[in-house]
């Protein structure tokens, strides 16, 4: 299938031109898209091209400005929040980046009602999270790893917790695992539906190892970062969930919510916690061990002022084939009764669905079946639900959006999505308004992404908030490469992949492959999404036939591909790289000699031992921020697949798939390791030791390190990577420059 | 201080048309909607339309659409009522008031111009 | 269109006695939690006054002795004490649906 079809005609060729990684690197062809943030069924607030904050009236069809540009830049806010109230809004400025979705801010509060910053009681600064109750204006916010309430804005704050240290206790906030392979959010508290308690978890990092890197700076001397950072089979941060009555916060304190006694018995995390009412709520625990995951249900005792996690109350779910749920456990969605839940997990065929719980998870009613998955529970109404999967036309790697009426019988099922811009839209998300009134639809391709608005109820299209006119303008004259996503069919296994072919792509020649790889357990990479990168770049103007393949391991396809690589992660992955690769070269269009291989993170672990398999195939390759060793990554990510690094469990494989294993492979294979030194994620350590072990066994090899740069590698160093990069392909390639 | 200044209220015939101005100071005209309210001798008040200044979006109490236009100079920080094909029933005092959209309230009220009309 | 029916249309008080103004509203105004109904003064020859908005928040420089409270159709303005100053004409007005529509008024006078 040709998703994104070149548009040259002869008559138009010479109008047109390539890509060029400037283009890339200027973000030249970047595209928008359009979450409206609401405030109620039919409002939402939309930052508008100049800067002001705008409320917009579905119903009405009228804008109000709630907060002008001037106002905004008077604290050089970035970022705003409004309180449910609508009195007031909180002003975010001095953003200051720490991990990758913790940052520190300064707030100011201002006054919609009298136009005025609120003077008195001012926050401190940097404040580490802040929210407003989800109704009226109370505030809570952390601060020094401490959580703090007001009533009202210009209130004195009281403080709720007292133990909070940096690197030791974690109040409110996540410490580093926990944010960045458990909750994927910078904060750890949550406001009951009404905003009477506040729930809070407190992690206690006082035994965790440091991990300590240089940060060079300008200084004489360079920083020390220290991070509690538990790597595999490492002392874990120890967690407790604390609720708090908010309108009497002094009366009986914080109470603490009691583990399930089959998870508090051994080693355990704390995945997620969700209000139900605001005198239930729903916490989600997980054994170290992560293949069993327990729900459990609280109630609040008026009487003892605690809260009570009855057995009856425990749902577990195990998996005896991987570990339990997907990237992460899946979080319950719950129905009207404030009792029964929506929840994906896997059905007897091994597919992620949606299950109804009612009474216990054995007695579940499976909502939606086939060998595809639901991938999203977005809302949950009195009579719909609307889900997003990969069902329709059996394409893995697409996202569309679907209604199931619960409110009827039998449930009738619908395709909001499926024909609406058939060809440019594919890959969908959704944003709802309260009660589902209204939702947004963001299309991000195969076509140029667009944005819309649509009813609640009658699913028809209300607007266009984004259509990116200036992108589909700015492409008009550009010879964008050709994408394909098929699939193959290797010994009982789907392989789907993306293929991306020069403009001017003719079967009968020969073209260098560049294989993109990342292959990270419950990853995807074939989706049908609309990118103008430097892959597209280096198809376009340089002429590369480009390859992304979803092997053993990845997402959406059911648990026999992802969960084979359970405790033996480095070997099917790459085994299926491989393979797609030879199937490649079958194709005829492939020189064989000029095949590369390319990978980020997991994909720099894959990449290099891809490049270490010592199947001859690729001439060269780049690994960038790899992994290369499991032992060096962090517990809860690299234990969920690979268990523990000690003898009775996984410490074999753990040392067989080590890059360090292989490096006598890199011989014949020219190699760029590529990472930052100040890399909180994937430590500089994995290169460094990849480095060593090739030095000791004496291969050339080809090195770049981004000094102070973390596992992103952005701003210029961004720019330098892809040149580096670029320079690297094209003389291993040898196309000139 | 915010003010808001109505004027070109007056005796006009049946079927005439008339234009009223409101000139506002003490704040910024594109940061807030401006609505127009009417009020008949001895009787309740009656809410016409509302502008977005900043793209110069209306919306209209259908009883007055197609009769009553609300539009806005912005380098003059005026907006305006035009009015058409006018009848005696819309002999008031015509008010504009400054609308707090995230609220959806009138905050700051003209002192009002009256228009009459009359054979 | 909503129709808002105030009563009672008119009221005769004393000045420190305690005075309830409602509204009712021919269908709910509840917009998800909140309720846009405002409350205004009008004194003779001058404009109204904007007393309260979303149901109970005051507005600027209005004193304390006015708050107002309600949702879904019923609404109340009460004047906790009354004052020489409060003899005037109230109106609600809801702007949870267009058109924004007004209440009849009440006329407080004085006893």
């Known amino acids: 299938i040709v998703l994104r079809p070149s548009r040259v005609h002869n008559s138009e060729e010479n109008t047109m031109r390539a890509l060029t990684l400037k283009d890339i690197l200027n973000g030249t062809f970047s595209y928008k898209t359009f979450f409206p943030n609401w405030i109620s069924g039919q409002e939402y607030l939309h930052q508008s091209a100049d800067n002001n904050i705008v409320l917009y009236n579905i119903e009405t069809g009228q804008s109000y400005t709630i907060l002008s540009n001037r106002t905004m830049k008077s604290v050089n806010a970035s970022n705003y929040g409004l309180s449910p109230d609508r009195q007031f809004v909180y002003l975010e400025s001095d953003y200051s980046k720490l991990w990758r979705y913790s940052y520190t801010a300064t707030y100011y509060i201002y006054d919609l009602s009298n136009g005025e910053f609120v003077r008195g009681n001012e926050l401190p600064r940097p404040i580490q999270y802040l929210c407003w109750s989800p109704v009226g204006s109370k505030l809570a916010y952390v601060y020094q790893n401490n959580i703090y309430l007001k009533q009202r804005p210009g209130d004195p704050p009281f403080q709720i917790t007292f133990n909070g240290r940096e690197n030791k206790i974690f109040n409110g906030i996540p410490d580093w695992v926990y944010e960045e392979e458990m909750l994927a959010t910078k904060y750890a508290l949550w406001w009951s539906p009404n905003g009477k308690f506040l729930a809070y978890a407190e992690f206690n990092d006082t035994d965790i190892p440091v991990i300590a890197y240089s940060y060079y700076g300008d200084e004489q001397y360079p920083r020390t970062i220290n991070i509690p950072y538990p790597k595999a089979g490492a002392k874990n941060p120890v967690v407790r969930i604390f609720i708090i009555d908010t309108t009497y916060p002094a009366y009986v304190g914080p109470q603490e919510v009691p583990v399930p006694a089959m998870i508090a018995s051994s080693d355990y995390y704390f995945s997620w916690l969700t209000w139900v009412t605001d005198e239930r709520v729903c916490l989600q625990w997980l054994k170290r061990v992560q293949n069993v995951s327990v729900l459990s249900i609280c109630d609040f005792r008026e009487d003892w002022q605690t809260w009570d996690c009855p057995k009856t109350q425990e749902h577990i779910e195990e998996s005896r084939t991987g570990w339990a749920g997907g990237f992460f456990v899946s979080t319950p969605v719950f129905s009207y009764d404030a009792i029964s839940y929506y929840k994906i997990f896997s059905d007897k065929d091994g597919y992620k669905h949606i299950h109804y719980i009612k009474d216990t998870v054995e007695n579940a009613i499976q909502i939606t079946s086939g060998k595809w998955e639901a991938i999203n529970i977005f809302r949950v109404t009195q009579d719909s639900l609307f889900y997003s999967s990969n069902e329709f036309e059996e394409y893995p790697g697409r996202r569309n959006i679907y209604r199931i009426s619960i409110g009827s019988y039998p449930p009738s099922k619908k395709c909001v999505t499926c024909h609406l811009r058939k060809e440019r839209c594919q890959y969908y998300t959704a944003s709802f308004s309260d009660y589902a009134k209204y939702y947004a639809l963001v299309c991000y391709g195969p076509g140029i992404p667009i944005s819309t608005l649509h009813d609640g109820r009658t699913d028809q299209e209300i607007k266009i908030l984004e259509e990116n006119k200036e992108l589909e303008n700015a492409l008009k004259n550009i010879q964008l490469p050709k994408e394909e996503i098929k699939k193959l069919e290797v010994d009982e296994i789907t392989l789907w992949y993306k293929m991306i072919l020069p403009p001017q792509f003719d079967r009968s020649k020969k073209y260098p492959l560049l294989i993109q790889v990342y292959g990270g357990p419950c990853s995807q990479s074939v989706r049908s999404v609309f990118a103008v990168n430097w892959i597209s770049y280096l198809a376009s103007k340089e002429g590369m036939v480009i390859a992304l393949v979803d092997g053993r391991g990845t997402a959406f396809q059911g648990d026999k591909l992802l969960y084979a690589v359970y405790r033996k992660l480095g070997v099917y992955e790459v085994e299926d790289q491989i393979t797609a690769v030879r199937k490649f070269i079958e194709m005829g269009f492939i020189d064989e000699k000029r095949i590369a291989i390319w990978g980020w993170s997991y994909g720099g672990y894959v990449s290099s031992l891809a490049l270490a398999s010592g199947t001859g195939l690729f001439k060269c390759g780049i690994a960038v921020a790899p992994v290369s060793s499991w032992e060096y990554y962090a517990s809860v990510y690299t234990e969920r697949f690979m268990g523990l690094p000690t003898k009775d469990d996984n410490l074999e494989h753990y040392k067989n798939s080590t890059v360090m294993a292989r490096a006598e492979y890199f011989r014949n294979v020219d190699y760029l390791l590529i990472h930052g030194t100040a890399d909180d994620n994937v430590h500089f350590q994995n290169s460094a030791q990849i480095a060593k072990a090739l030095v000791n066994a004496q291969v050339d090899f080809q090195a770049m390190w981004y000094s102070d740069q973390n596992h992103g590698l952005s701003g210029l160093s961004t720019n330098h990577l892809y040149t580096h990069m670029t320079h690297f392909l094209k003389q291993c390639f040898s196309l000139s420059d | 201080e915010v003010q808001l200044l109505e004027s070109g209220g007056g005796l006009v015939q049946p079927g005439g048309s008339l234009r009223l101005s409101c000139a506002a100071s003490?704040?910024?005209?594109?940061?807030?909607?401006m609505d127009w309210v009417r009020q008949a001798p001895g009787k309740g008040l009656e809410w016409v339309g509302d502008i977005y200044p900043n793209t110069g979006g209306t919306i209209y109490n259908q009883k007055f659409k197609g009769r009553f236009t609300i539009s806005i100079d912005k380098s003059k920080n005026t907006a305006y009522l035009q009015m058409n094909s006018l009848r005696a029933e819309d002999t008031a005092v015509y008010y504009c008031?400054?609308?707090?959209?995230?609220?959806?309230?009138?905050?700051?009220w003209g002192q009002g111009t009256t228009v009459t009309v009359s054979s | 269109d909503i129709q808002m029916t105030q009563s009672p249309s008119s009221l005769s008080a004393s000045v420190g006695d305690r005075v309830t103004i409602t509204c009712r509203a021919s269908e709910s105004v509840d917009n998800y939690g909140l309720s846009f109904i405002n409350w205004f003064q009008q004194k003779p020859g001058q404009p109204p006054k904007l007393l309260i908005y979303?149901?109970?928040n005051r507005g600027s420089g209005v004193p304390s002795r006015f708050s107002g409270s309600g949702s879904g159709t019923d609404f109340t303005l009460t004047i906790s004490s009354l004052q020489p100053e409060d003899f005037a004409m109230y109106f609600c007005q809801q702007s949870n649906e267009v058109p924004y529509t007004f209440g009849g008024g009440t006329k407080v006078e004085i006893k």
């Open positions: 003490g704040y910024t005209l594109t940061d807030y909607n």
């Open positions: 979303g149901t109970s």
């Open positions: 008031t400054r609308f707090r959209g995230i609220h959806y309230a009138m905050d700051y």
